[in-house]
């Protein structure tokens, strides 16, 4: 199974002296997830032609995936570390249902999909420890997530392939924006 960052003492400088919320540890964790996403995207692109699909087809998909917007304070202009940290945690919590959907979508990369899901849960815990303004963080309703999952799994094959592609692409973009923003916190 893929090794989570920090599980191997060679992976982190002075592993025992670092708090779990340290900048380096969080950064390593995000990069680990991004590596996992790259592997999953590779399998998705090899399996279907979604990666070359037209933007029109992508725009037609009505998934409500978390996305960074100016008001979230995570971009260089209008950067706000408190607002942004809340957005990152909220967004990751919202992505969890989509990561659950991915679990049965891969054959050769099944372990990788599980590793992405598990390490995202750990990342959320790290960031929640870092966040002071926990009141502003809203957790998605379990019933809402369950019905969304059922709906996604009921789609036809083409839509499921498109959904998988969109989740991975959006999650990658979200994590890359998070990485840039967290650097200044």
């Amino acid at each position: 199974a893929p090794v989570l960052p920090g599980e191997d003492s060679k992976d982190v400088a002075a592993p025992h002296s670092q708090p779990l919320t340290s900048s380096e540890r969080i950064d390593k964790h995000i990069r680990y997830i991004l590596d996992g996403i790259s592997a999953l995207r590779k399998e998705t692109c090899n399996r279907s032609n979604m990666c070359e699909s037209s933007k029109e087809a992508l725009a037609e998909n009505n998934l409500n995936l978390p996305k960074m917007a100016e008001k979230d304070g995570c971009f260089q202009s209008g950067f706000n570390e408190d607002t942004c940290l809340v957005k990152i945690i909220t967004g990751l919590l919202e992505f969890e249902v989509y990561l659950e959907y991915l679990q049965n979508r891969f054959e050769s990369s099944e372990e990788q999909a599980r590793a992405v899901q598990m390490s995202t849960k750990v990342l959320i815990q790290f960031l929640q420890k870092k966040a002071k303004n926990l009141d502003a963080i809203t957790t998605p309703e379990p019933t809402t997530n369950a019905s969304l999952l059922t709906k996604l799994q009921a789609q036809n094959q083409w839509l499921q392939d498109m959904t998988t592609h969109l989740i991975l692409r959006s999650f990658k973009e979200f994590l890359q924006s998070s990485l840039r923003a967290l650097r200044q916190m």
């Epitope: 982190v12 400088a13 900048s23 380096e24 950064d27 990069r31 950067f79 570390e81 200044q184």
Partner: antibody, heavy 118, light 109 residues
């Protein structure tokens, strides 16, 4: 053009205090974490402290922890370093620098000299 | 405490290629350490050359390049020039702090 201008250095006795300032221009100051780095005569640079973009988090090197306080005023585009209980080993040129990110490298000022001597 | 290690000195012939390294006393250097490289000539403030592993600072000649090779960060100067004779320092983010290496004195012979 990115500019960082340190001020407030000078001669101070051991046990004394000093407050350094760094005026920033040419970039979105409030979007960047900022650091103080010092360099003692004939030595290499030593990281002193960092403050997050919004000022909510501060970090210190072991040698200054409990004696120095970093702060910032984003409305004035200014970074500060309050130095208390100064020691001879704090003698150095103090530089302020932005934390690289958003496609911008880290820029350093020209520095301000702090001399701790009786 | 984790120590950032650099070669104390290095020499290179004009036009030659030299690679300076930056390691950790415990563990490997990764992109999450955001390796940075600085050049300092006598009487001058340090000048940033490379940030975030391999991003060249504005105004820095393209003969300077950064990378991570094996378990260390590296600064490569391709086609060294007389004005490259200087002290070179690397910096790594470790945990929540930044640590500088002891520096490499580069001589262009």
């Amino acid at each position: 053009e990115v500019q960082l201008l340190e001020s407030g250095g000078g001669l101070v006795q051991p046990g004394g205090s000093l407050r350094l300032s760094c005026a920033a221009s040419g970039f979105t100051f409030s979007s960047y974490a900022m650091s103080w780095v010092r360099q003692a005569p004939g030595k290499g640079p030593e990281w002193v402290s960092r403050i997050s973009a919004g000022g909510g988090s501060t970090y210190y090197g072991d040698s200054v922890k409990g004696r120095f306080t970093i702060s910032r005023d984003n409305s004035k585009n200014t970074l500060y370093l309050q130095m208390n209980s100064l020691r001879a080993e704090d003698t150095a040129v103090y530089y302020c620098a932005n934390r690289a990110g958003w496609g911008l490298g880290d820029y350093w000022g020209q520095g301000t000299l702090v001399t701790v001597s009786s | 405490q984790t120590v950032v290690t650099q070669e104390p000195s290095f020499s290179v012939s004009p036009g030659g290629t030299v690679t300076l390294t930056c390691g950790l006393s415990s563990g490997s250097v990764t992109a999450s350490n955001y390796p940075g490289w600085y050049q300092q000539t006598p009487g001058q403030a340090p000048r940033a050359l490379i940030y975030s592993t391999n991003d060249r600072h504005s105004g820095v000649p393209d003969r300077f390049s950064g990378s991570i090779s094996g378990n260390k960060a590296a600064l490569t100067i391709t086609g060294a020039q007389a004005e490259d004779e200087a002290d070179y320092y690397c910096a790594l983010d470790i945990g929540d702090i930044t640590e500088f290496g002891g520096g490499t004195q580069l001589t262009v012979l």
